[in-house]
């Protein structure tokens, strides 16, 4: 039985040409996990493998890094980066785990006033 | 047109170790991922391992770890894999093969291949 | 590691025939399911990707349905240069893993 939940930043702002980081974390589960894939809508964005570490898509290869931990950083931001984006923890016993996070990029005087949560 | 050439067949000798090359041309070499694959004689296909040209970001099956090293040389467009401590078990056709564009997990293209035999 | 399970291991047909070949994954890999064509003493080459994206040149006879766990390739109408032997593979937990193959043989 799955047991586990995933927790997530979820909605987020950030500004144009910024960073953020976009985190997940997997709880009440002694499940291993054994990857975690992050994908925008259906794009594969990057790859935390146990055994093979981190892999990157060759499209987000300047823009995308690894971490912390198992999340991930995304960089010089756009506003074609608004959209959803989903953390994928495959795990053992269990099975897979998906958590959503919607990332809004605004325009820099937008997102100085903007009330939403954001992580600094 | 995308190619991937590879060097000639090898015999070697149970113990040793033995280095492939697959030159690439006709795209730009750091924007795809390379793989390796083989396939033992009338047998089907096991992946090996994966490098990134673009950093050399590396990362291997489990199965071969401390055994395959991949690497690649960005100046001449090539890709390498060292498989060490030979046994019979690795005779098999080794062929390296390109990621495709939209996930860097599928192969798009494939090099002709190279024959390993390991005989004593 | 997740074991795809290919089914038929062979199969005879005839020019024209429809044929359909099956990949069950041992757990879910969404649509992460590529096909490949190889003929004897030659390289693997890619058909379908993503489950049902046909890849460039691959003609339309080749056709890729399925998600989750269960994954069919179907040749519309089998044509003398389509015998050869096809895998299936996934690609959303590594380590990639590979069907171990249909040898479509002439009837």
């Known amino acids: 039985m799955m047991t586990g939940t995933i927790e997530t930043t979820g909605n987020i702002s950030a500004e144009k040409g910024g960073s953020i980081i976009l985190q997940c974390h997997l709880s009440s589960t002694t499940a291993q996990v054994t990857q975690v894939n992050w994908e925008q809508q259906d794009q594969l964005l990057a790859i935390c493998n146990a055994d093979l570490g981190w892999h990157i898509s060759p499209s987000f290869k300047d823009r995308v890094a690894p971490g912390p931990g198992l999340g991930l950083t995304l960089q010089s931001l756009t506003v074609n980066d608004t959209g959803e984006y989903f953390c994928i923890y495959h795990t053992y016993p269990d099975g897979t785990y998906t958590g959503r996070i919607f990332l809004e990029v605004l325009e820099s005087s937008v997102a100085e006033h903007g009330a939403r949560f954001q992580i600094p | 047109e995308v190619q991937l050439v590879q060097s000639g067949a090898e015999v070697k000798k149970p113990g040793a170790s033995v280095k492939v090359s697959c030159k690439a041309s006709g795209y730009t070499f750091t924007d795809y991922y390379m793989h390796w694959v083989r396939q033992a004689p009338g047998q089907g296909l096991e992946w090996m391992g994966l490098?990134?040209?673009?950093?050399?970001?590396?990362g291997y099956n489990r199965k071969f770890k401390g055994r395959v090293t991949m690497t690649r040389d960005t100046s001449t467009s090539t890709v390498y894999m060292e498989l060490s401590s030979l046994r019979s078990e690795d005779t098999a056709v080794y062929y390296c093969?390109?990621?495709?564009?939209?996930?860097?997990?599928?192969?798009?293209?494939w090099g002709q291949g190279t024959l390993v035999t390991v005989s004593s | 590691d997740i074991v795809m399970t290919q089914s038929p291991s062979s199969l005879s047909a005839s020019v024209g025939d429809r044929v359909t070949i099956t990949c069950k994954a041992s757990?879910?890999?969404?649509?992460?399911v590529a096909w490949y064509q190889q003929k004897p003493g030659k390289s693997p080459k890619l058909l379908i990707y993503?489950?049902?994206n046909r890849y460039t040149g691959v003609p339309d006879r080749f056709s890729g349905s399925g998600s989750g766990t269960d994954f069919t390739l179907t040749i519309s109408s089998l044509q003398p240069e389509d015998f050869a032997t096809y895998f299936c593979q996934q690609y959303t937990l590594y380590p990639l893993t590979f069907g171990g193959g249909t040898k479509v043989e002439i009837k």
């Open positions: 993503s489950a049902s």
């Open positions: 490098v990134y040209p673009y950093n050399d970001n590396t």
């Open positions: 093969a390109r990621g495709g564009p939209s996930n860097w997990n599928y192969f798009d293209y």
């Open positions: 757990q879910n890999v969404v649509t992460a």
